[in-house]
């Protein structure tokens, strides 16, 4: 069971200080941007991260969402990264949801932080370069200190 | 680059088995699904079942469960698509196609150049 | 499972006109439709996503529309590299994907 606490206004980097948004065809991707290039292109670099306390404590249980015309809620269904139209709910009735993630920090290095699906245990969100595109997937953690499942989350409230 | 690369062209006898494979490269192989669709001579586009590299899980067509087995080898990157009696019913095309993940989202984004299958007596 | 008609069966226009393709869905599938244009020879290639948004380097002539059970791809003035078979895929129930039977666009 998972129940609806306050939300926070985000910005979310890789480790290589790319910035995480949302483009014109609802598709994530990190990209270099300056302060003033991340204001300008909220609110599509601005993800509201709602917080939910967790039945079974296993990590700060989150979901991450972005308002651009309308609320779209990250998913990793069928371990498949979107976007889905819909708000973050006030109260979810199950042990684990596609939508939401533990966000923890690196052991050892509080600022670091890992996104684990709470439906697929092992597989964290993480930054992949494709082509001349760094992309946000679902990975599963294959070797300790794996850089790609490491963001940095900077709040903007 | 990013890009499925397939085996080549079989023909084979009724009652011989096969096993097609699927490289993928320029990408994390292992966190994206892998799903095989059947082109048969003149006709339109058929999807068999998926494969997820990363753990093997496997999702099948109704109507091609029990007709062929798709399994993957994530060390080598590869998936495949395997049939233990051929029929001559199974002469197509058949295409890998990477489902997208994040960017085109459940869509087939990146496809393979297809393996023609040949079965004749 | 989900079943999607595609009109016409083959479509003869001449370049520089339009070209209007349709798609049906036998249930609603909201707009989780995407279109591939595949040429002989060739793998089909993903052309639209989530019914009207156009993958990377799709030429702006092609738009997509619709939602529900009723979709078009539309060509505004058709090049001849645009001559090929188009299908619609629906997604809504991955993954229990269904194509439709496809339409051929031919010069007139």
């Known amino acids: 069971y998972f129940g609806k606490l306050e939300s926070k206004l985000s910005v979310i980097r890789n480790l290589n200080d790319q910035v995480l948004f949302i483009d014109q065809g609802n598709r994530p991707l990190f990209e270099d941007m300056t302060d003033s290039d991340c204001r300008d292109n909220a609110p599509r670099t601005i993800f509201i991260i709602s917080m939910y306390k967790d039945s079974q404590p296993r990590g700060m249980a989150v979901t991450i969402s972005v308002k651009c015309e309308k609320i779209s809620t990250l998913s990793c269904e069928n371990k498949i990264i979107s976007f889905k139209e819909m708000n973050p709910p006030d109260n979810i009735k199950d042990t684990k949801s596609d939508i939401i993630f533990f966000q923890r920090s690196v052991p050892g290095h509080d600022n670091k932080m890992q996104f684990e699906s709470s439906s697929y245990e092992g597989y964290f969100l993480a930054c992949e370069k494709e082509r001349d595109l760094f992309k946000l997937i679902l990975k599963k953690e294959d070797e300790l200190g794996d850089r790609s499942i490491m963001f940095t989350v900077q709040n903007e409230d | 680059e990013v890009q499925l690369v397939q085996s080549g062209t079989e023909v084979k006898k009724p009652g011989e088995s096969l096993k097609i494979s699927c490289k993928g490269s320029?990408?994390?192989?292992?966190?994206?699904?892998i799903g095989w669709v059947r082109q048969m001579p003149g006709k339109g586009l058929e999807w068999m079942g998926f494969?997820?590299?990363?753990?093997?899980?496997?999702r099948y067509s109704p109507t091609f469960q029990g007709q062929v087995t798709i399994s993957a080898d994530k060390s080598f990157n590869t998936a495949f698509l395997q049939w233990s009696s051929l029929k001559a019913s199974d002469t197509a095309m058949y295409y890998c196609?990477?489902?997208?993940?994040?960017?085109?989202?459940?869509?087939?984004?990146?496809w393979g150049q297809g393996t023609m299958v040949t079965v004749s007596s | 499972e989900i079943v999607m008609t595609q009109s016409p069966a083959t479509l003869s226009v001449s370049p520089g006109e339009r070209a209007t393709l349709s798609c049906r869905a036998s249930?609603?599938?909201?707009?989780?439709l995407a279109w591939y244009q595949q040429k002989p020879g060739q793998a089909p290639r993903l052309f639209i996503y989530?019914?009207?948004t156009r993958a990377t380097d799709i030429p702006a002539r092609f738009s997509g529309s619709g939602s529900g059970t009723e979709f078009t791809l539309t060509i505004s003035s058709l090049q001849s590299e645009d001559f090929a078979v188009y299908y619609c895929?629906?997604?809504?129930?991955?993954?229990?994907?269904?194509f439709g039977q496809g339409t051929r666009l031919e010069i007139k």
């Open positions: 196609a990477r489902v997208g993940s994040g960017w085109y989202p459940y869509t087939f984004d990146i």
């Open positions: 320029g990408y994390t192989v292992t966190s994206y699904w």
């Open positions: 494969i997820y590299p990363g753990d093997s899980e496997t």
């Open positions: 249930e609603s599938i909201s707009s989780n």
């Open positions: 989530t019914a009207s």
């Open positions: 895929q629906q997604y809504n129930n991955w993954p229990s994907i269904t």
